[in-house]
């Protein structure tokens, strides 16, 4: 008799895109429509929830733009929450100062990506300093990870 078919394990991967109705931090993400992937990872209230310990590549890109540059400091962070830790742990952070000419139209992207050892029940989020300056187009602002 033929051996039973191998049970294929779901690849743990997520790619979420910008959601323009984000009103507060952490950023909220589109998890259903468009170029979205969500497999073996849960999405809950702005966060990606890990359900298996291991090494993961985590990434996020945020596209900032404005019309009359005031050079407000911009920050883009990916951070983690876990019931074991009393406070948020910043995993990656990008900062921009003096990035445009006063009064001019401008646009800047911030990309963060690195490998982390994540534990089951870790929650990952993205924070920005100036929500009003984020362009939420799905190709411009996104958040994701995949298990190595």
């Amino acid at each position: 008799p033929s051996p039973p078919p191998e049970k294929k394990e779901l690849r743990k991967v997520a790619h979420l895109t910008g959601k323009s109705n984000s009103r507060s931090m952490p950023l909220e993400w589109e998890d259903t429509y468009g170029i979205v992937l969500l497999s073996g990872v849960k999405y809950k209230k702005g966060g990606l929830v890990i359900n298996e310990t291991g090494l993961y590549f985590v990434y996020s890109k945020v596209y900032f733009r404005g019309q009359s540059c005031n050079n407000l400091p911009l920050s883009h962070k990916v951070y983690m929450r876990n019931s074991k830790y009393p406070q948020d742990l910043v995993m990656m952070e990008g900062k921009m100062m003096s990035y445009c000419t006063t009064g001019q139209m401008w646009a800047r992207s911030s990309y963060l990506g690195a490998v982390f050892n994540l534990t089951s029940a870790d929650h990952l989020y993205v924070n920005v300093s100036e929500l009003s300056l984020v362009n939420f187009e799905e190709s411009q602002t996104f958040f994701g990870l995949y298990k190595l």
Partner: antibody, heavy 119, light 111 residues
Framework: EVQLQQSGAELVRPGVSVKISCKGS????????IHWVKQSHAKSLEWIGV????????SYNQKFKGKATMTVDKSSSTAYMELARLTSEDSAIYYC????????????WGQGTSVTVSS | DIVMTQSPASLAVSLGQRATISCKAS??????????MNWYQQKPGQPPKLLIY???NLESGIPARFSGSGSGTDFTLNIHPVEEEDAATYYC?????????FGGGTKLEIK
């Protein structure tokens, strides 16, 4: 309520300088750039320049370089514009207006400051 | 600099009728899918008041009888039906690039 309160009318002699002010209230002053606009009978509305309320650096219309100097005092939420070496051509109403970086236009304007240059 | 040419310089419109004001830019004021054209209303002794931004978007609190249209270099402000309180001077302005520039203004009189 958002307000931009400008200083009062000025009657000045030719050749002197004048400094006018624009105090913002009812919003976070450092979130918006401040633009200055000149209105005269001869030239309608002319954009003078813009200042970053956060950093204090400015961009000027080439035509007003050397004529106008913009500054900002974050502690008092006030923007200033000094006009130098005044001539009768500078007689006009000067407006300040705020511009949200995430928007398209100057959404709130001061009431205007009338500057009259006369000997 | 982008030159903004407004027409007509003045017009008189009967109460309840349509007022149409045109503005032509010397080069396109479009960028990345948006038109950086704004319209302001100014009454004597008052500062300009924002009516329309990004060519066709009505500023909060402005009556729906005001509308804007156009893209590239040609833009239009329509007021319909015109009311007594609309007597004012109207200016177009581009915010596509510095220095920002304004049209010469159109004075609207209500007959």
């Amino acid at each position: 309520e958002v307000q931009l309160q400008q200083s009062g009318a000025e009657l000045v002699r030719p050749g002197v300088s004048v400094k006018i002010s624009c105090k913002g209230s009812g919003y976070t002053f450092t979130d918006y750039t401040i633009h200055w606009v000149k209105q005269s009978h001869a030239k309608s509305l002319e954009w003078i320049g813009v200042i970053s309320t956060y950093q204090g650096d400015a961009s000027y219309n080439q035509k007003f370089k050397g004529k106008a100097t913009m500054t900002v005092d974050k502690s008092s939420s006030t923007a200033y514009m000094e006009l130098a070496r005044l001539t009768s051509e500078d007689s006009a109403i000067y407006y300040c207006a705020r511009f949200p970086d995430w928007d398209y236009a100057m959404d709130y304007w001061g009431q205007g400051t009338s500057v009259t240059v006369s000997s | 600099d982008i030159v903004m040419t407004q027409s007509p310089a003045s017009l008189a419109v009967s109460l309840g009728q349509r007022a149409t004001i045109s503005c032509k830019a010397s080069q396109s004021v479009d960028y990345d899918g948006d038109s950086y054209m704004n319209w302001y209303q100014q009454k004597p002794g008052q500062p300009p008041k924002l009516l329309i931004y990004a060519a066709s978007n009505l500023e909060s609190g402005i009556p729906a009888r005001f509308s804007g249209s156009g893209s590239g270099t040609d833009f239009t402000l329509n007021i319909h039906p015109v009311e007594e309180e609309d007597a004012a001077t109207y200016y177009c302005q581009q915010s596509r690039e510095l220095p920002y520039t304004f049209g010469g203004g159109t004075k609207l009189e209500i007959k």
